[in-house]
């Protein structure tokens, strides 16, 4: 039975009907509904929202909607013992304290249960000492401090500005440098766009605004107490000392008004260059310690947060496939927020809600997708991607056998300039073809396709006439599906103009000011960008679930594999003498990539020609496509990162948000000139080339004719 027969509607009509049913006004209404109170993971409010979504998805027409709960490690401030940082004088008197909460936005003054800014999973502690300013606390910033400036952070409290890399990497770097505490702050250079007013008069960060966030280094583990396995009723939990990824030193975030008071007194070394200066009226001296008159003053942290095993709830909705019910296409995004979640996550959750409603409407009219679609509202994403990871751990055997694709649906917007897509190369052609069929919402592109406006505003650096599509990194709920399980994944949202706005993320990210009004007044008053994102995400899900042949093009993987091989070879060739000394060769990798390219090309030819009316052959070809991403998984994982198992892509070891290609080789080569045992270090490079070459060759062979 073809999918046309199964659904009784032609595929083209189906897609149009689905897209036409998506309405901006509904997304707006859903966003409002989801953002009136905080929905912090582990709270009653977020449980109530889970039950509301379950009920509404059932009303929309899904076949089943269940809550999946887990008991995971979360972190909360102590309600009676607030966290803060002090400047203390020689007598130990507190002469300045950082704020205890953010000044509430207009209309929200009487809202209870707004969690004050904190760094989730910070240990308790009251360290005091001299301050050292460490710029963004990136690997290269500590190299500059320690190697070039000879500044020792051991026993110091470091202050780092947010931006550029994931905050957990900053904390890890500070720990490795010997710091005894970390202060994170938002500098206006990164979180205040010139010419825009601060909230509530614009979308910029006010001086009292603070970015919350977790500071874990989980490397894909999920719940810190149950790595690899679901945190269910009979789980064996590690002791807190053995928990995965917890920071060992106190950490606390502040806004730029508080940072001003800490940084204005800094003495010691001048900043090494202009890249270390932000936009505050302070010298950006590195320290250690305060200048002359204030040299006897110290900084003291007061951190009293607690880690608690708490119940979380995912909502899992199912729309059963008519032809291949054992093939799953998953659309998932999180529900938990730090406060109101105006952008993160509810701009995404509202879009998912409208996509579910549209699919439900079609189902009520007698239509079903060819494959099963699973919809997920994840919990505790903000605490380390916990809800999605625990569910995937619980269902890993089903997912690795049946998972076709995962489309992520966190924040729909981080700006209103153009589309941003990160995905597996298998989805490039799907995204290109889909965006050519969608109308651009952009001013000046009326009557033009989304593909056209996107390509114009965000051109590919390699291929003219094509848009930029980025590598998947992490920091969101696709991680477990892609990096651990090898399920083809993608994400799409509207973004800012990276050329003119060099700030990190969007200014009000994870602050109390991320409200419905922020979106409705400043980002997307007509909700046209939200609608476009709904069409892209929904359209991808529709095609993945309904096309007879999976819309994956393995030839695009061949192209990027060659690009990544060239790139990693170039990095290695910065050490020609060592490559010669230790007989380091990339021949096996380039050979494997060549084989992959040839086999992928032949597979694509067969894909055009095979008899699609033969369900066995169709299923066989589709399985080869589905399992291609899976073939890049190394069951042993990457060195010291067992849950990052994808050999082609992993989150950067220096920035969880960024994707790195051939990460095993990359990490082996990183800073290799400083390794104490060069022979051992280059031996590891060779081993990683071997693993990569083998994996690419093995993946290629999954595309060969089966017999």
């Amino acid at each position: 039975k073809s999918s046309n027969e199964a659904t009784n509607i032609t595929p083209k009509h189906n897609m149009k009907a689905f897209l036409d049913e998506l309405k901006a006004e509904n997304i707006k209404k859903f966003l409002y509904n989801f953002t009136q109170i905080p929905h912090l993971a582990g709270t009653e409010q977020n449980f109530q929202l889970a039950k509301q979504i379950q009920s509404q998805w059932k009303e929309f027409g899904l076949d089943s909607v269940e809550l999946a709960h887990y008991d995971v490690l979360l972190s909360y401030p102590n309600k009676t013992h607030p966290n803060y940082i002090s400047i203390i004088n020689e007598d130990g008197n507190e002469i300045f304290n950082t704020s205890l909460f953010e000044p509430p936005p207009p209309g929200y003054e009487n809202v209870s249960d707004i969690v004050p800014p904190f760094s989730a999973f910070s240990p308790q502690g009251m360290p005091e000492g001299d301050l050292v300013y460490v710029n963004y606390a990136r690997t290269e910033d500590f190299f500059k401090l320690e190697r070039d400036m000879k500044i020792n952070c051991s026993g110091k409290i470091v202050i780092a500005r947010y931006g550029k890399v994931f905050r957990g990497n900053k904390v890890k770097n500070a720990q490795l440098a010997g710091a005894k505490g970390v202060i994170l702050y938002s500098d206006p250079a990164d979180y205040f766009a010139p010419g825009v007013k601060s909230y509530p008069d614009g979308w910029n960060l006010p001086g009292g605004g603070v970015q919350r966030g977790n500071i874990l280094n989980l490397n894909g583990a999920g719940d810190p107490l149950t790595p690899g396995y679901p945190a269910n009723e009979y789980a064996y939990r590690r002791g807190i000392a053995e928990a995965v990824g917890l920071p060992s030193i106190p950490v606390h975030p502040i806004g730029y008004y508080d940072a001003q008071k800490l940084l204005e007194k800094m003495g010691g070394s001048a900043p090494p260059d202009s890249s270390w200066r932000g936009s505050l009226k302070v010298p950006y001296n590195v320290g250690p310690g305060f200048t002359g008159n204030f040299s006897t003053q110290k900084v003291k942290m007061h951190i009293h947060s607690t880690n608690e095993v708490t119940r979380i709830y995912n909502v899992i909705g199912t729309l059963r496939g008519a032809v291949e019910p054992d093939r799953y296409v998953i659309l998932g995004g999180h529900r938990d927020s730090w406060v109101f979640g105006g952008i993160d996550p509810q701009s995404g959750a509202a879009v998912v809600h409208e996509i579910v409603r549209s699919f439900g409407t079609l189902k009520k009219e007698g239509w079903r997708p060819r494959r099963t679609i699973l919809f997920a509202s994840w919990d505790a994403e903000e605490f380390g991607l916990l809800g999605s990871t625990e569910w995937a751990e619980e269902n890993s055997r089903l997912l690795q056998e049946r998972g076709v694709a995962y489309i992520n649906a966190d924040s729909s917007i981080e700006g209103n300039y153009t589309l941003r897509v990160d995905c597996t190369p298998l989805m490039y052609s799907l995204v290109h073809n889909l965006t050519k069929e969608l109308k651009s919402p952009d001013e000046g592109f009326e009557g033009k396709s989304l593909y056209e406006s996107w390509t114009k505003k965000s051109p590919s650096p390699e291929f003219s006439g094509m848009p930029r599509i980025s590598k998947l990194g992490s920091g969101n709920d696709f991680e477990v599906f892609f990096q651990r399980l090898g399920i083809a994944s993608g994400r799409a949202r509207y973004t800012k103009n990276w050329e003119t706005n060099k700030f990190s993320g969007y200014p009000l990210y994870h602050s109390v000011y991320e409200t419905y009004e922020l979106v409705e007044k400043f980002y997307d008053p007509m909700f046209k960008y939200h609608l476009t994102v709904a069409q892209v995400r929904g359209g991808m899900v529709f095609e993945l679930a309904n096309s007879i042949v999976l819309p994956f093009d393995c030839r695009d993987y061949a192209v990027v594999l060659r690009k990544y091989a060239d790139k990693i070879y170039s990095i290695s060739m910065k050490h020609p003498q060592e490559m010669k000394t230790y007989s380091v060769s990339f021949d096996s990798l380039f050979s494997a990539v060549k084989n992959f390219t040839e086999i992928a090309s032949k597979f694509s030819e067969r894909l055009q020609d095979f008899d699609k009316s033969n369900p066995i052959v169709l299923r066989m070809m589709n399985d080869q496509l589905m399992f291609l991403e899976r073939a890049f998984i190394d069951p042993l994982g990457l060195p010291d990162r067992p849950f990052y198992r994808h050999v082609i892509y992993a989150p950067s070891s220096h920035n969880k948000y960024a994707g790195e290609s051939f990460p095993g080789i990359y990490d082996a080569l990183f800073d290799i000139e400083s390794k104490v045992d060069p022979s051992k270090a280059w031996g590891e490079v060779k081993r990683q080339i071997y693993v990569a070459a083998f994996t690419v060759q093995a993946a290629a062979e999954t595309l060969s004719e089966v017999a």
Partner: antibody
Framework: EVQLVESGGGVVQPGRSLRLSCAAS????????MHWVRQAPGKGLEWVAV????????YYADSVKGRFTISRDNSKNTLYLQMNSLRAEDTAVYYC??????????????????WGQGTTVTVSS | QSVLTQPPSASGTPGQGVTISCSGS????????VNWFQQLPGTAPKLLIY???QRPSGVPDRFSGSKSGTSASLAISGLQSEDEADYYC???????????FGTGTKVTVL
């Protein structure tokens, strides 16, 4: 209309206590720092104390340190000054004032933009 | 005793200009912004200048502020009879950890 109305002044004997209140309206009280300033008869202005929006910081003039306590109740939109161990030299008109926002620093380091009309405290035996 | 020093008085005829000085130190004027207040007889003080030289809405542009190093000044051009008042400079003092007012200057319109 932004308004600050002080109350609680009066005549009090040396060594006794008094609590001044300042009722705020017409602005979002919880988001502003607040000051107390006084003016002795025929004298200039003397700053007394300031409190941040969240009470994380309280600063006092040396002349009142250890005797006066500034506090606020954001749910009531009210600022307080608890004055203990009063002295004759505390005799003055006491003004409450809203901290001034300039966009570069916490408002409580920036002075005042809106003042109440004042309440008179007389310390006399 | 105030740490910001002002002349006790200044005067001028209508239409004339007058300048009031305010002398401080590195811990107040030298490192923090200066405000100026006007107090008309029998009334509460009113903000005249903030952030060294900014006028709140409603304050005539006859009033201007400036700062250099550890000193500040308030200039009143085109003096008018309603300008007769006490004028105070003020700033946060980092050493005292408190706000300080100047000694005050009585402006008389002759």
């Amino acid at each position: 209309e932004v308004q600050l109305v002080e109350s609680g002044g009066g005549v009090v004997q040396p060594g006794r206590s008094l609590r001044l209140s300042c009722a705020a309206s017409g602005f979002t009280f919880i988001t502003y720092g607040m000051h107390w300033v006084r003016q002795a008869p025929g004298k200039g202005l003397e700053w007394v104390a300031v409190v941040s929006f969240d009470e994380s910081n309280k600063y006092y003039a040396d002349s009142v340190k250890g005797r006066f306590t500034i506090s606020r109740d954001n749910s009531k939109n009210t600022l307080y000054l608890q004055m203990n161990s009063l002295r004759a030299e505390d005799t003055a008109v006491y003004y409450c004032a809203r901290a001034l926002r300039d966009g570069n620093n916490w408002d409580y380091f920036n002075g005042m933009d809106v003042w109440g009309q004042g309440t008179t405290v007389t310390v006399s035996s | 005793q105030s740490v910001l020093t002002q002349p006790p008085s200044a005067s001028g005829t209508p239409g004339q200009g007058v300048t009031i000085s305010c002398s401080g130190s590195s811990s107040n004027i030298g490192s923090n912004t200066v405000n100026w207040f006007q107090q008309l007889p029998g009334t509460a003080p009113k903000l005249l200048i903030y952030s060294d030289n900014q006028r709140p809405s409603g304050v005539p542009d006859r009033f201007s502020g400036s700062k250099s190093g550890t000193s500040a000044s308030l200039a009143i051009s085109g003096l008018q009879s309603e300008d007769e008042a006490d004028y105070y400079c003020a700033a946060w003092d980092d050493s005292l950890n408190g706000y300080v007012f100047g000694t005050g200057t009585k402006v008389t319109v002759l």
